[in-house]
């Protein structure tokens, strides 16, 4: 099948002891091979500070996955989610202020 680029969505969880969990979700993409990782100041975080979801079919012939990490509240602007899929790549910021999600469809 032809390439379907992912929809990328970044969300923040509730604050807990000064930390927040930021989750980057990639959905509705094909083929299934994808790179999704959190970066701090442009550098990828170590594997043991990130949690990945399995790449699973969504029932529509496309796939989805996610990656999450915990960060200090107030440092959101230092973190970005990096996505690479079928030769395309993109960087997605953590939403700032009261906004709790941000999404973008790659073309």
């Amino acid at each position: 099948g032809s390439t379907v680029p992912p929809m990328v969505n970044v969300t923040c969880s509730e604050v807990s002891e000064g930390n927040i969990t930021v989750t980057c979700r990639a959905s509705s993409f094909y083929p299934r091979n994808i790179t999704l990782t959190w970066r701090q100041d442009g550098v990828s975080l170590s594997h043991n500070t990130q949690q990945w979801g399995d790449v699973l079919p969504d029932g529509n012939g496309t796939y989805q996955t996610w990656v999450a990490t915990r960060i200090r509240q107030g440092e959101e602007q230092r973190f970005t989610c990096y996505m690479e899929h079928s030769g395309n790549h993109g960087t997605h910021p953590v939403p700032s202020g009261n906004s709790h999600h941000h999404h973008h469809h790659h073309h």
Partner: antibody, heavy 122, light 112 residues
């Protein structure tokens, strides 16, 4: 963990249809794969199908493709399974169960409803 | 379809004993995403099944550490190190790697 509340027992006639419901609360509905399973008395379990609540996409066991139809209503946080052209072979307990995709379990049936008994009898 | 074969069918135990249940799949059950979705469930009479083990060896939250899962390829095992009264019931293995997902026939753990 959240709740999965299934509809009550059904007594239906052969050839009829029935729509079972699984109403959820206490978790983000759209993040879940909801599966339906069948269990006849004293027997093992059979997986019927799953539906991903976030998109309505689904995957079926071919054996049940013409028997079961899965839908979700995100506004009421409810998953449904319609069973059609019922025969006595369809008499069983039907369970809904969920996989929390953005949770940590990585298991397909982490949380279960209590089941709905469907009896097909003339 | 992947056939899941459990042995034994019935397992009489004394409380405090170790119990071991075997599950063999008719083919390798590695998902295309490289995970092995081999799970174990316990069903007590009149209740819904409950998840014990997922991805071969991971205990689900709240499951006592006397339960352990192991295996690879086509051979998998559930062990209960010291059987307690609350462990009695029917155990099912399950594969969620290849559609249609399938269960084993069940192993009934009961008092000798």
């Amino acid at each position: 963990q959240g709740q999965m509340q299934q509809s009550g027992a059904e007594l239906v006639k052969p050839g009829a249809s029935v729509k079972l419901s699984c109403k959820t609360s206490g978790f983000t509905f759209s993040d879940n794969y909801i599966s339906w399973l069948k269990q006849k008395p004293g027997q093992s379990l059979e997986w019927i199908a799953w539906i991903y609540a976030g998109t309505g996409g689904s995957s079926y066991n071919q054996k049940f493709r013409d028997k079961a139809q899965l839908t979700v209503d995100t506004s009421s946080r409810t998953a449904y399974m319609q069973l059609s052209s019922l025969t006595t072979e369809d008499s069983a307990i039907y369970y809904c169960a969920r996989h929390d995709y953005y949770g940590t379990s990585g298991a397909w049936f982490a949380y279960w409803g209590r089941g709905t008994l469907v009896t097909v009898s003339a | 379809d992947v056939l899941m074969t459990q042995t034994p069918l019935s397992l009489p135990v004394s409380l405090g004993d170790q119990a071991s249940i075997s599950c063999r799949s008719s083919q390798h059950i590695v998902h295309s995403n490289e995970n092995t979705y081999l799970e174990w469930y316990l069903q007590k009479p009149g209740q819904s099944p409950k998840l014990l083990i997922y991805k071969v060896s991971n205990r689900f939250s709240g499951v006592p550490d006397r339960f352990s899962g192991s295996g690879s390829g086509t051979d998998f095992t559930l062990k209960i190190s010291r059987v307690e009264a609350e462990d009695l019931g029917v155990y099912y293995c399950f594969q969620g790697s290849h559609v249609p997902w399938t269960f084993g026939g069940g192993t009934k753990v009961e008092i000798k």
